[in-house]
Amino acid sequence: LNTTILTPNGNEDTTADFFLTTMPTDSLSVSTLPLPEVQCFVFNVEYMNCTWNSSSEPQPTNLTLHYWYKNSDNDKVQKCSHYLFSEEITSGCQLQKKEIHLYQTFVVQLQDPREPRRQATQMLKLQNLVIPWAPENLTLHKLSESQLELNWNNRFLNHCLEHLVQYRTDWDHSWTEQSVDYRHKFSLPSVDGQKRYTFRVRSRFNPLCGSAQHWSEWSHPIHWGSNTSKENPFLFALEAEQKLISEEDLGGEQKLISEEDLHHHHHH
């Protein structure tokens, strides 16, 4: 969590006095101390981790998490059933696929069990918090003497993802970047046969099915170039790895996708 210094000399304060053990438990410091912010990320719509910075508590505190979905059939308050820990202190909660409903408002509540009135509630749009797995099975083939095509797969509904391709040669100091829509392929029209190229790709759940800001991890890099002999079958025998985008994928111009698809459909 980032904090902002509100005054240049730190003079704005809340004094927390602890008197005797007979004092009520809602002493000033405990009841006014803000709870840490909860950050949730939905990993490939397979599971979701909601985490908080447990270290921001001035004493060891096993904060508890409850959640529900606002204005929906799933509005019953649920307790976290799978806590994540940092040094034996709760620092997160993992929710499984069946508990994730991307297109309903997710409400998450953090509470201090030592001081139940110390609680904080946040509302999150889960479709904006999806992080896909990194693209896999990067393959290259020649379209012509000087043109290369890069293909990859995602373990997800392909039409929900946009992609970023980076490539560079061993002579370059920085990457060249190219955005790619849901088609998950990229062509490089002019290739210098004397150079070695490196490609990598990452993906994002945007813009058709959500508006996520976070990219996946980068794929493993794939190389092509001068130290690869022309006889190397790697350049040519990759058709089995290439897949055309199905009509189903191309027809997904709507913002929403069905819960059933999200839970059961994986496109390889």
């Epitope: 904090t3 101390l33 001035p58 060891p60």
Partner: antibody, heavy 122, light 108 residues
Amino acid sequence: QVQLQQSGPGLVKPSQTLSLTCDISGDSVSSNIATWNWIRQSPSRGLEWLGRTYYRSKWYKDYAVSVKSRITINPDTSKNQFSLQVNSVTPEDTAVYYCARMTGPRYYFEYWGQGTLVTVSS
Amino acid sequence: DIQMTQSPSSLSASVGDRVTITCRASQSISSYLNWYQQKPGKAPKLLIYAASSLQSGVPSRFSGSGSGTDFTLTISSLQPEDFATYYCQQSYSTPPITFGQGTRLEIK
């Protein structure tokens, strides 16, 4: 590497105010996982925690009951330091004073100042 | 407040001895118990945190155990540099943070 450097007078007259400062390097007094503590040590009381300040979107202070009415701990973000003031001192306040940092999630004092012997005497 | 009681308050031992110091909390503190070593004129130095975890750079002859209310610090084979005062400290329920009264380890 975090370092805490203490400064302040070693001799204070009874009824006056004891003032010490702890300069922080290698961390920020506004860290949102640290608490900045004052501890003193005397033969009669052993190691005695006096209080702490910490920043969690605003400043908080906790004080020990034994000194609550006489103590003030203040952070200074512009100088990256925090200070201790003890009012109306008596000879019983004679001790070695330490500043120390505690952080979660392990909650121990890993970094200490070098200590300042403060003698209360006329 | 949670009171911390160390025993013994002082102890005489010889180089090579195995030494055990105990610390008892007035109520359960889970494993939030730390041990410090202090030499004259110096600030305390962290040895063991979370009851049994050895702080980086501390010799392996130091070990800690316990949970709840009863804890021990063990030095398996005393070295000349180990003669010092040892303190336990709880951070489970704060404020206040409380220390044991100390155990002074002297050369026999």
